[in-house]
């Protein structure tokens, strides 16, 4: 295919509108206008041939490189003969220098010579002698240079005058391209042909309207050969969310359908509990009262928070409560139900209430529970407790209302003391016990009841304020039933389990610990 010239910059065609930068301002190069055939002709000229030490710069506006790798610069200019000036003007020159600088951004009026690289010295094939100049017979020169490969987003050209009498009438910058192409939902623009015969220019394709490169996928690329043919396609584009492939284009999903990501799949029908989608939908909006959690895929039906837990029961066991409940009757359409238990305690005397999370102990962390039961211990006696069990799922955070059930329980007794046998002899048993620290302040005394096993007619009672007692005057090698009960101002607390402890036989004398 025949390479096409694509113009990046055309001074002559711009009608003096480009506003190139001159340095120093106004003293060297300047824009001039002439009228030819009733049309304005613009040129940048400089002619300070008599002054010596000239260093005048003319910089183009920033030119976006686009796909160009090698650019071609065509200049049309006139140069006046130095002999047109008195004494041949010793400082007069008949050439000027062409420079370029690449950059990723437009530096605006910030001009720095050091950033520019010389392309060439531009010399005229023909100079305009004095007689020709006065007769308006100027000799127009055409010179072309090329630069490449270019890598930055754009570039500037600059023209340095060192004391010539030059008029620059045309500056045209262009590059050569392969024809545009549509392949794999990617549009390949007319693109610069390789600058050397064996080279292939790699060209990034642009996805067609409503197509994108899939995440992790390769950008569409092709190679433009020197003859203008496209070779070696790589990568592809996919229709973006809300669009599906129809021939070589991406078409919006029909109403009632959606596509939530760039993929090769077609649009899908809106899931349950969604409103009918408009054309080009990337997801389907949820019905009133239904929601989509951030992590929910768009293909999943919309869901709602669960109803409250079902059948909550609180069974008191001394200073413990076992809470049990059944799952909500309405799960909201989700599997991710978790439960949170909160506790409130109320003092019967004052009616004052407050949270009790800090003073009670749960058999497992009370938030984010997946099981439907939990045991709460370390409850204080003679206290009213209200337990709230809240059911939540992945969309509960999207609403302000909560789904919970409450159960109340009164703790009238202290927790049964935990009893241990500390030591024994043939005629004595040393017993100790403990109850949870929060309850200890309420205990007035502890009552230890003991009797021989099998003898239901008589028993002995000992009272103590401490946490241990030694039971004396016992029969050797005999099993005793021992129970400890806390006594509070309000009455008796829960009794411990009845423990069986045996005194030593006469042969095994000595006070041995168990």
């Amino acid at each position: 295919a025949q390479g096409k010239e694509v113009v990046l910059l055309d001074f002559a065609a711009a009608g003096g509108e480009l506003g190139w930068l001159t340095h120093p301002y106004g003293k060297g190069w300047d824009l001039m206008q002439n009228i030819m055939n009733d049309m304005p002709i613009y040129m940048y000229s400089v002619c300070n041939v008599m002054s010596g030490d000239q260093d005048n710069w003319l910089r183009t506006n920033w030119v976006y490189r686009g796909e160009a790798e090698r650019i071609f610069i065509e200049l049309k200019f006139t140069v006046r003969d130095c002999n047109s000036f008195p004494g041949g003007a010793s400082s007069c020159k008949e050439t000027f220098n062409l420079y370029y600088a690449e950059s990723d951004l437009d530096y605006g009026t910030n001009f720095q010579k050091r950033l520019f690289t010389k392309i060439d010295t531009i010399a005229p094939d023909e100079i305009t002698v004095s007689s020709d100049f006065e007769a308006r017979h100027v000799k127009l020169n055409v010179e072309e240079r090329s630069v490449g490969p270019l890598t930055r987003k754009g570039f500037y050209l600059a023209f340095q005058d060192i004391g010539a009498c030059v008029a620059l009438l045309s500056v045209r910058v262009y590059y050569k391209k392969c024809p545009e192409l549509l392949q794999g939902l990617a549009h390949f623009p007319e693109t610069i042909a390789g600058s050397d015969a064996p080279s292939l220019a790699t060209v990034a394709g642009t996805c067609v309207d409503h197509a994108v490169v899939p995440p992790g996928g390769e950008e569409p690329r092709m190679h433009c050969a020197v003859d203008g043919e496209w070779l070696v396609p790589i990568g592809q584009c996919l229709c973006q969310a809300g669009y599906e492939k129809v021939e070589d284009a991406c078409q919006a999903c029909s109403p009632g359908f959606f596509k939530f990501e760039a993929s090769e799949s077609p649009c899908l029908e809106c899931p349950e509990h969604t409103l009918p989608s408009p054309e080009g939908a990337t997801s389907c909006e949820c019905e009133e009262g239904f929601f989509r959690a951030p992590q929910d895929p768009a293909s999943m039906p919309c869901t709602r928070p669960p109803s409250a837990p079902h059948y909550l029961t609180a069974v008191g066991m001394g200073a413990k409560v076992e809470l049990r409940w059944t799952p909500p009757q309405d799960s909201g359409g989700r599997e991710d139900i978790v439960y949170s238990v909160t506790c409130e305690q109320c003092w019967p005397e004052s009616g004052e209430c407050g949270p009790c999370e800090a003073s009670v102990r749960y058999s497992e962390p009370p938030h984010g529970l997946t099981r439907t039961s939990v045991t709460v211990s370390d409850l204080e006696p003679h206290m009213n407790y209200t337990f709230t069990v809240e059911a939540r799922n992945g969309v509960s955070g999207l609403v302000t209302s909560r789904s919970f059930r409450t159960a109340s329980v009164s703790i009238n007794q202290t927790e049964p003391p935990k009893v241990r046998l500390e030591g024994r002899s043939t005629t004595s048993l040393s017993v100790s016990w403990s109850i949870p620290p929060p309850q200890q302040s309420r205990v007035w005394k502890y009552e230890v009841t003991y009797r021989k096993k099998g003898d239901s007619n008589s028993y002995n009672v000992r009272r103590t304020e401490g946490f241990s007692v030694t039971l004396d005057d016992l029969a050797p090698d005999t099993t005793y039933l021992v129970q400890v009960q806390a006594l509070t101002q309000e009455g008796q607390g829960a009794g411990s389990k009845v423990h069986e402890f045996q005194t030593l036989s006469p042969e095994g004398s000595g006070n041995l610990a168990v």
């Epitope: 003096g16 301002y25 003293k27 300047d30 001039m32 206008q33 002439n34 300070n48 000036f85 009026t109």
Partner: antibody, heavy 120, light 109 residues
């Protein structure tokens, strides 16, 4: 229509200051270099100063360098000349003028002129 | 030198042709522009570049240049052409940015 309207002239004592304004209308002010040119009573035209379209570049005649400052506000389409340390020889009609192309002219649009008299 | 020299005065009979000259080294490098100024008014651009007239300027005004000289010619002068005429050019010496001639008073007799 395309025009430049000047204001700010008047009588000022030697050593004093004055600010001239030149309001542009009817054209894209920010695309043109602007100049001040003065004319002493009964004398010829004398170029004073220039400012580039974006206001980044200025240049002054030796006779006013260090005393006069040219500036522009493209958002207000207005050109200014701040004149300090005025001397009797600065007495003149001051014109603002548009350079039709480039930095140096020709001057295709002129203001009506404003008289600055420096006298004690 | 960065000066432009004009004759102080020139006169012409109505309908006749008159030429006002402007001399200066800068004119070897740069074209002159010509301005007309009538009493109490701002200057008006007449000619610029090789020989370009802004719209509204009668075609009896023309410009030319040769070497260090530029000329403004009025072919068939009219009474309303009585005015001061100034040449102006870029300065090639680097001393100034742009220079004006001293002006020529044209009298139409």
């Amino acid at each position: 229509q395309v025009q430049l309207v000047q204001s700010g002239g008047g009588l000022v004592q030697p050593g004093g200051s004055l600010r001239l304004s030149c309001a542009a209308s009817g054209f894209t002010f920010s695309s043109y270099a602007m100049h001040w040119v003065r004319q002493a009573p009964g004398k010829g035209l004398e170029w004073v100063t220039v400012i580039s379209p974006d206001g980044h570049n200025t240049y002054y005649a030796d006779s006013v360098k260090g005393r006069f400052t040219i500036s522009r506000d493209n958002s207000k389409n207005t050109l200014y000349l701040q004149m300090n340390s005025l001397r009797a020889e600065d007495t003149a009609v001051y014109y603002c003028a548009r350079a039709s192309v480039g930095a140096t002219g020709p001057f295709d649009i002129w203001g009506q002129g404003t008289l600055v008299t420096v006298s004690s | 030198s960065s000066e432009l020299t004009q004759p102080p005065s020139v006169s012409v009979a109505p309908g006749q042709t008159v030429t006002i000259t402007c001399q200066g080294d800068s004119l070897r490098s740069y074209y002159a522009s010509w301005y007309q100024q009538k009493p109490g008014t701002a200057p008006k651009l007449l000619i610029y570049g090789e020989n370009n007239r802004p719209s509204g300027v009668p075609d009896r005004f023309s410009g030319s240049s040769s070497g260090t000289s530029a000329s403004l010619t009025i072919t068939g002068a009219q009474a309303e052409d009585e005015a001061d005429y100034y040449c102006n050019s870029r300065d090639s010496s680097g001393t100034h940015l742009t220079v004006f001639g001293g002006g020529t008073k044209l009298t139409v007799l």
